[in-house]
Amino acid sequence: FNISGCSTKKLLWTYSTRSEEEFVLFCDLPEPQKSHFCHRNRLSPKQVPEHLPFMGSNDLSDVQWYQQPSNGDPLEDIRKSYPHIIQDKCTLHFLTPGVNNSGSYICRPKMIKSPYDVACCVKMILEVKPQTNASCEYSASHKQDLLLGSTGSISCPSLSCQSDAQSPAVTWYKNGKLLSVERSNRIVVDEVYDYHQGTYVCDYTQSDTVSSWTVRAVVQVRTIVGDTKLKPDILDPVEDTLEVELGKPLTISCKARFGFERVFNPVIKWYIKDSDLEWEVSVPEAKSIKSTLKDEIIERNIILEKVTQRDLRRKFVCFVQNSIGNTTQSVQLKEKRG
């Protein structure tokens, strides 16, 4: 299809080499007080095309994205050629930064309702650069946390080193939807709730004498509870003795609940005590069996191929630890009678 009639937008993604970050392109970027237009060709090519409003973003769940190769080759379907780019409804997600993402991206609805239609389309010229500005050492992260129930703020990473006074007008989106009330480089959240979690996009316009382009950054915002003040507790085993059959295989499970910590380094391990000796056992990897906002339950098993008489004289100890402290639970094996 002919892309010369597409509305064009220039975007700049300046990524930090220090952090993992994502980027997004919206198919129908709903700018305030302005709708996109598309051309509909009438029978006579000499006629001035009639401007029709572009479909609202609600209608755009079924769109096709293409990349325009710089060598003039035909348009390439994004889904077939670019595994690090994911399409979600009308949004294109770039999972990894890199200058190789620079280029022209075109989107249009899959359904063209009339043979006279030249599909509404948007062409986005994306320039991707690594951040070179070392003067801003403490720029806001692309991953930001908000503490539930408290006051917090979401900062636009590309503008966080500028004061509010010198900051340009910013356009904010959450999960692809425009937040038209928010216009500064920081959204102040007076009271943090679960619905504040999500993917935020901040845009501002930068211009030089020749052209203007949109500088965009993506922020993943997570709502969290305060760090736990408690050491982990062991949910299983509860009893300190366990009846077993000699010669049979045995699996003992250790399940522990760890409270939320922003920097989470849980330890869960098994060791064996035999008279004065103590050694850690090589056991299968720990696995998370339940994760909520407030805590996580982690399980780690010790597997004995067959229970021996020697095992009955040993203590099997599960040890769990977080930044607050540690807890242990020991199990003594006892031969089943009868």
Epitope: K174, S180, V181, E182, V188, D190, E191
Partner: nanobody, 120 residues
Framework: DVPLQESGGGLVQAGGSLRLSCVAS????????VGWFRQAPGKEREGLSC????????LYADSVKGRFTISSDNAKNTVYLQMNSLKPEDTAVYLC?????????????WGQGTQVTVSS
């Protein structure tokens, strides 16, 4: 006079739908945002969704995104929460609250709540 009044709760089978209403009296919807919250026994209050009627912007918690839809009718001074594909874990008291300014503001007034029970 209660500034916010919820209705529409009830007992529903898993997979079913309910539509909750929150009528605001004493202030106009275009001056505030309204949030829907829920409280289950022994759990923290959870912020589900919020709508800023002045610009129509909406926010959703991950737990309800794609299943619940918030909307408002300024003429009726009412905010709705359409709940589809309900699950037993959605059982709770559902409350609406007035939020100062936009959805990033502070809650100022709360309704009494309406009970939603989802049976399996």
């Amino acid at each position: 006079d209660v500034p916010l009044q919820e209705s529409g709760g009830g007992l529903v089978q898993a997979g079913g739908s309910l539509r909750l209403s929150c009528v605001a009296s004493g202030f106009a919807l275009d001056e505030i945002a309204v949030g829907w919250f829920r409280q289950a026994p022994g759990k923290e209050r959870e912020g589900l969704s919020c709508i800023s009627s002045s610009d129509g912007s909406t926010l959703y918690a991950d737990s309800v995104k794609g299943r619940f839809t918030i909307s408002s009718d300024n003429a009726k001074n009412t905010v709705y929460l359409q709940m589809n594909s309900l699950k037993p874990e959605d059982t709770a008291v559902y409350l609406c609250a007035a939020v100062r300014g936009s959805c990033f503001g502070r809650t100022t007034h709360w309704g009494q709540g309406t009970q939603v029970t989802v049976s399996s």
